[in-house]
Interface confidence: low
């Protein structure tokens, strides 16, 4: 049975086996086509989601689709039902929390009262002044909190207590990539992890431990990527994995927060990377223990310089490392998070690509998660 499962796939009606390598090859080998059903699927970027959260205290903003202008949500008459609608628009299914926060001196958007229409937030037509003088601070999911805060700089062994959202993504029980838990159903990783194996069956997710082999595997229901853009082959290196059964959160299994839409990190901002990747470039072996390292944002202009990536780093990517090299992600770390800590931990990047590992002028290049928030929300909404 184990050998059969490893090398063959069972078609139904009529029952017969086909070689597993014929799964997800674009050809219908089973009469009913089930060999092409459970494959990595692409999902277009889709329309703009009409709600978003700002880094200014996670305040809610709503889009007026008629004008294309964004407005800040006034706390007047804001209800739990409206909070749930806002979060559902972003694809969250969990119970949100919200509170009033004072309108700050730097408030640059008009503040309007919010109502609901067809399960979408709208601006109240006859909206007067925001009498409460407060905005809506909204949290769709409790995220980004760990039991332990990393304190050191440089590279060292990590504890799952510090990074409870880190998962190992495995094919045929072999670690291939890292990933991050975003909510009970969803794991964020890199699309390039699935280039070689596009069938969903043999992919598993392992969560809740900092040691590679020591935790139970979770079945994957779906793997979703963005349509491949041949003009920018390194772009869109992002994937979402939907788990077959929702995770039960604990001290060692928790979600990380998505970044805010306006999370612009300046050069030298401290960030963290984690992974079980290769510990020596061009060889070595996968680390059995989760490793963590502190890095910093590296200016895209510097990263695109003639002695570096010569323009290959697009606006949907970001560079991170340390200026003289030596601390970087490497093979096997792909898909893992590049993290920023404010009040909570946010996954601002996904380990994507780079030339070598730890070179001084060629730092790690990461998928910029804030550039794909719309896509993530649209995927989640479609799967609600």
């Amino acid at each position: 049975k184990v050998i059969l499962d490893k090398y063959y796939f069972l078609c139904g009606q009529p029952l017969h086996f086909i070689p597993r390598k014929q799964l997800c090859d674009g050809e219908l080998d089973c009469p009913l086509g089930e060999d092409e059903e459970h494959c990595v699927k692409s999902f277009p970027e889709g329309p703009a989601v009409a709600v978003r959260l700002s880094k200014d205290r996670s305040t809610l903003q709503v889009l007026d689709s008629a004008t294309g202008n964004w407005f800040s949500a006034c706390f007047d008459n804001f209800t739990e039902a409206l909070a749930e609608t806002a979060c559902r628009q972003m694809g969250y299914s969990s119970k949100p929390t919200f509170r009033a926060v004072e309108i700050g001196p730097d408030q640059d958007l008009d503040v309007v009262e919010i109502t609901e229409n067809s399960q979408e937030l709208r601006m109240r037509n006859s909206s007067g002044p925001c009498l409460s003088g407060s905005l809506v601070s909204l949290h769709c999911l409790a995220c980004g909190k760990s039991l332990k805060t990393p304190r050191v700089v440089g590279v060292e062994e990590a504890s799952v207590d510090s990074w409870p959202w880190q998962v190992s993504i495995q094919y045929d029980k072999q670690h291939v990539c890292g990933g991050s838990i975003l909510d009970p159903h969803w794991v964020l990783t890199a699309a390039h992890c699935f280039r070689k194996h596009t069938d969903v069956f043999n992919w598993k997710v392992r969560a809740g431990s900092d040691k590679l082999g020591s935790f139970p595997s979770l079945a994957v229901a779906k793997i979703i990527i963005i349509e491949f853009n041949p003009m920018y082959p390194k772009d869109n290196d992002i994937a979402l994995m939907k788990l077959q059964f929702p995770l039960t959160f604990s001290g060692t299994v928790r979600p990380i927060c998505l970044p805010f839409f306006d999370e612009e990190l300046t050069p030298a901002t401290p960030l963290w990377i984690i992974g079980w990747g290769f510990t020596k470039q061009n060889g070595g072996k996968m680390s059995d223990i989760l490793l963590q390292a502190s890095v910093q944002v590296i200016d895209s202009t510097r990263c695109n310089a003639d002695d570096a990536y010569q323009g290959e780093v697009t606006e949907k990517m970001m560079c991170a490392g340390i200026p003289e090299g030596g601390v970087d992600t490497c093979q096997g770390d792909s898909g893992g998070p590049l993290m920023y800590q404010s009040d909570q931990w946010h996954v601002v990047g996904i380990v994507s690509w780079g030339y070598g590992c730890g070179g001084p002028s060629t730092p790690g290049v990461y998928t910029k998660v804030s550039a794909y928030l719309n896509w993530i929300y649209n995927v989640w909404k479609a799967e609600l």
Partner: antibody, heavy 121, light 107 residues
């Protein structure tokens, strides 16, 4: 060879100003965090200030009086010192951060030869 | 701020002696400690970083150890050129702070 050369030190009266410069060579200056460290005569080492990208950091003893800056096109680090006091008398060293970790931490290597600032009436 | 306490403040030793200098941090700094050597009229020189990593070009008779709050610099066999003042420095957070120094003199 990596080299750092400080200049601009001298005798100044209390309340006066001075601008120190540190010329760097032998490395990509703009990619590195840079520091000023001082040493009063016969005393130990005291960190003064650091600069990285757009971030600047200062010791409490100089905050509001000293300003660190850099000109990457000229490979030069500066320390503008205003409202000088007698206790600012020291040899001022410019040093590079070897950047073995994130900003907010690090050691100093190499160091310049130092420039003496004397604040006295 | 993290305080760094070095001891002894001075010591007398002979060529060939094994010399140990200790440094204590007021809070846990993991392994983020550096050691410097300074000779009169000269700039300091980095000897050890990350508590125990020897800076390139530094003789192997120098070694560092420790983690957390307690650290040690050891010179296994003191040479004439090692008579100098030694400083420890915490490298984990601003403000970066140094120990008061240990002057190693000829006995």
């Amino acid at each position: 060879e990596v080299q750092l050369l400080e200049s601009g030190g001298g005798l100044v009266q209390p309340g006066g100003s001075l601008r120190l410069s540190c010329a760097a060579s032998g490395f990509t200056f703009g990619a590195y965090v840079m520091h000023w460290v001082r040493q009063a005569p016969g005393k130990g080492l005291e960190w003064v200030s650091s600069i990285s990208g757009g971030s600047t950091y200062y010791a409490d003893s100089v905050k509001g009086r000293f300003t660190i800056s850099r000109d990457n096109s000229k490979n030069t680090l500066y320390l503008q010192m205003n409202s000088l006091r007698a206790e600012d008398t020291a040899v001022y060293y410019c040093a590079r951060h070897p950047v073995r970790g994130v900003i907010g931490a690090g050691w100093f290597d190499p160091w310049g030869q130092g420039t003496l600032v004397t604040v006295s009436s | 701020d993290i305080q760094m306490t070095q001891s002894p403040s001075s010591l007398s030793a002979s060529v060939g002696d094994r010399v140990t200098i200790t440094c204590r941090a007021s809070q846990n700094i993991s392994r983020w400690l550096a050691w410097y050597q300074q000779k009169p009229g000269k700039a300091p020189k980095l000897l050890i970083y990350a508590a125990s990593s020897l800076q390139s070009g530094v003789p192997s008779r120098f070694s560092g150890s420790g983690s957390g709050t307690d650290f040690t610099l050891t010179i296994s066999s003191l040479q004439p050129e090692d008579f100098a003042t030694y400083y420890c420095q915490q490298a984990i957070s601003f403000p970066l702070t140094f120990g008061g120094g240990t002057k190693v003199e000829i006995k």
